[in-house]
């Protein structure tokens, strides 16, 4: 890391070190030999989240309902607004600039992890002994019915998409 001419939270201007403006404030004028750095608070719709020498504050992010967005956390003078997606939708990127519907798990697949405002549904194939016969964003793979516990026998084997079919035991002897 190269040497710096100033302390942390200072910047070099005109061969002297001036104090940076604290988070939530913007630079109005650099320090001089006789005056300190002049800073002003950001307005209500703006923010700056670091020690800085910015002459303009950044606008808070707008959570556009037309894109399925809603406010998760209102911005302050030091933090940006955090957007999240409405129910049934999730963000398309980490910065959450738009939303898309949660995906459904097709028959033969179950929900491993239910979607959130920031992550999509995670599906998994139903293993042997489990099935899913619906397309769903919530349903997990369900276990095949246990015919034995009902005093029945398997008449039709289950698959990853269908349950077993149970029937009465054949009581006739050969």
């Amino acid at each position: 890391e190269p040497p710096t001419a100033c302390r942390e939270k200072q910047y070099l201007i005109n061969s002297q070190c001036c104090s940076l403006c604290q988070p939530g404030q913007k630079l109005v004028s650099d320090c001089t030999e006789f005056t300190e750095t002049e800073c002003l608070p950001c307005s209500e719709s703006e923010f700056l989240d670091t020690w800085n020498r910015e002459t303009r504050c950044h606008q808070h992010k707008y959570c556009d309902p037309n894109l399925g967005l809603q406010v998760q956390q209102k911005g302050t003078s030091e933090t940006d607004t955090i957007c999240t997606c409405e129910e049934g939708l999730h963000c398309t990127s980490e910065s959450c600039e738009s939303c898309v519907p949660h995906r459904s798990c097709l028959p033969g697949f179950g929900v491993k992890q239910i979607a959130t405002g920031v992550s999509d549904t995670i599906c998994e194939p139903c293993p042997v002994g489990f099935f899913s016969n619906v397309s769903s964003a919530f349903e997990k793979c369900r276990p095949w019915t246990s015919c034995e516990t009902k005093d029945l026998v398997v008449q039709q084997a289950g698959t990853n998409k269908t349950d077993v079919v149970c029937g009465p035991q054949d009581r006739q002897r050969a």
Partner: antibody, heavy 126, light 107 residues
């Protein structure tokens, strides 16, 4: 009262490394930058760099870049200066020095040293 | 880097004399200058900072002046304990730099 107590004298061979410690007491260690200054025998004072004990941030003089490492352990209020690849012209007394806490500093880095360690003599000789 | 040039490099004086040491910066440093006193085998001791502010506990016979590039340390009436080496140091920007020192010796 404020005290900076340094580790004892060291004798090292060329190419070796040395690590000098500086234990602070009598003030909030994380509240003031710690600097390292050295003085070769019969010579003047030479600034080596600083560490901010609060953040761990450092700033080294160009001359020592890549050879010096300044660290700290806030749990025991101690700053360290390690100098690698020692040469005979690194023979000097090494001082830690605390930043003077200035109430009014409009500009400039305002680094004055109001407290110094007693010094650690490092002799580099084959 | 800012070069600090001190003069004279040594001065012989008697107790009671007025002694003046000058320090010149290679570029303007406003009032960001300190003066230190160092005795043999000891760490430096801060006398003056921001060019003219006397450090707590330092006798008032020491005074500092100047701004920009030219600075002066004055000892109004030299005392036996003042025989030492004096250094100036700029505190405008890093790297901090010191003058080469002025040795005040007994005449």
């Amino acid at each position: 009262q404020v005290q900076l107590v340094q580790s004892g004298a060291e004798v090292k061979k060329p190419g070796a490394s040395v690590k000098v410690s500086c234990k602070a007491s009598g003030y909030t260690f994380t509240g003031k930058y710690m600097h390292w200054v050295r003085q070769a025998p019969g010579q003047g004072l030479e600034w080596m760099g600083w560490i901010n004990p609060d953040s761990g941030g450092t700033n080294y003089a160009q001359k020592f870049q890549g050879r010096v490492t300044m660290t700290r352990d806030t749990s025991i209020a101690t700053a360290y200066m390690e100098l690698n690849r020692l040469r005979s012209d690194d023979t000097a007394v090494y001082y830690c020095a605390r930043d003077q806490p200035l109430g009014y500093c409009t500009n400039g880095v305002c680094s004055y040293f109001d407290y110094w360690g007693q010094g650690t003599l490092v002799t580099v000789s084959s | 880097d800012i070069q600090m040039t001190q003069s004279p490099s040594s001065v012989s004086a008697s107790v009671g004399d007025r002694v003046t040491i000058t320090c010149r910066a290679s570029q303007g440093i406003y009032s960001w200058l300190a003066w230190y006193q160092q005795k043999p085998g000891k760490a430096p001791n801060l006398l003056i900072y921001t060019a003219s502010t006397l450090q707590s506990g330092v006798p008032s016979r020491f005074s500092g002046s100047g701004s920009g590039t030219d600075f002066t340390l004055t000892i109004s009436s030299l005392q036996p304990e003042d025989f030492a080496t004096y250094y100036c140091q700029q505190a405008n920007i890093f790297p901090l730099t010191f003058g080469g020192g002025t040795k005040v010796e007994i005449k």
